[in-house]
Interface confidence: medium
């Protein structure tokens, strides 16, 4: 069966903002069957996962930047 | 209070299709996916598959696929399924049931809707 | 598919005594990217539709009494009802939310003696 990490939330708990020199790529999951809310989860530079608040203004200056990098899909 | 009101019980020819519906209450319909699950007479639960009402995304499984048909009208908050070819196989209790994929499960079910597939 | 094994079919048991059930699955239902079991336990009186007792395999849901239990991850699960109650006859379902296709055992049907 397919990986549960491509099918179901991933994010129980998000943060507010993380610092932009701390994250190595983002990924941005759309809502769909498999996940009902939008999830924005940061690799970071140590290799740990975190989950973002997509709403959160820091957050989305975060993905802006990252997408100007192209780090981020 | 959510509520999740299905439409009325069906008796059908063979061959034939049905629709059924499950009109949302309580909550914004399109926050949460609405899956649906068949229940044949007095046998365990079969996942149907599952629509997500704000994008109509859906997700079948393949034993379904090409028997179920998942749609939604977010102006009504209203979920439908229509089965097709129906057979005596079909014959069965169908539920409603919302969740969001986020480890909670499907945490409220509709009351459920016969379906009898008989000539 | 994940196919979902619960024992036993059904159980006779008197108000007041433990009851345990067992739930396995062909597949871990442990998500790897937060460390959670995706393992819910329904319970479903006659004539009514199943009702979400237990998510996160160990997650009372809101409103749910606290005689009820589940534990366990992996694959190996376990629902227990600490004090049985009549009301508490009925048919028990656990189900894997890990992967699709979502599937369901095939039950314990709860008898009171």
């Known amino acids: 069966a397919p990986l549960a990490t491509e099918l179901r939330c991933q994010c129980l708990q998000t943060l507010q903002g993380i610092h932009l020199k701390n994250i190595q790529s983002v990924k941005v999951k759309s809502p769909g069957p498999h996940c009902a809310q939008t999830e924005v989860i940061a690799t970071l530079k140590n290799g740990q996962k975190a989950c973002l608040n997509p709403a959160s203004p820091m957050v989305k200056k975060i993905i802006e930047k990252m997408l100007k990098n192209g780090k981020s899909n | 209070e959510f509520q999740l009101q299905q439409s009325g019980p069906e008796l059908v020819k063979p061959g034939a299709s049905v629709k059924i519906s499950c009109k949302a209450s309580?909550?914004?319909?399109?926050?949460?996916?609405m899956n649906w699950v068949k229940q044949s007479n007095g046998k365990s639960l079969e996942w149907i598959g599952v629509?997500?009402?704000?994008?109509?995304?859906?997700s079948y499984n393949q034993k379904f696929k090409g028997k179920a048909t998942l749609t939604v009208d977010q102006s009504s908050n209203t979920a439908y399924m229509q089965l097709s070819s129906l057979t005596s196989e079909d014959s069965a209790v169908y539920h409603c049931?919302?969740?969001?994929?986020?480890?909670?499960?499907?945490?409220?079910w509709g009351q459920g809707t016969s379906v009898t597939v008989s000539s | 598919d994940i196919v979902m094994t619960q024992s036993p079919s059904s159980l006779s048991v008197s108000a007041g005594e433990k009851v345990t059930m067992s739930c396995k699955s062909s597949?871990?239902?442990?998500?790897?990217?937060?460390?959670?079991?995706?393992l819910a336990w329904y319970q479903q009186k006659p004539g009514q539709p199943p009702k979400l007792l237990i998510y996160?395999?160990?997650t009372r849901k809101s409103g749910v009494p606290d005689r009820f239990t589940g534990s366990g991850s992996g694959t190996d699960f376990t629902l227990t009802i600490s004090s049985v109650q009549a009301e508490d006859l009925a048919v028990y379902y656990c189900?894997?939310?890990?992967?699709?296709?979502?599937?369901f055992g095939g039950g314990t049907k709860l008898e009171i003696k």
């Open positions: 189900q894997n939310d890990h992967s699709f296709p979502c599937t």
């Open positions: 597949q871990s239902l442990l998500n790897s990217g937060n460390q959670k079991n995706y």
């Open positions: 049931a919302r969740g969001m994929g986020l480890l909670f499960g499907m945490d409220y």
């Open positions: 629509i997500n009402p704000k994008y109509g995304t859906t």
């Open positions: 309580g909550y914004s319909f399109t926050d949460y996916n």
């Open positions: 996160g395999a160990s």
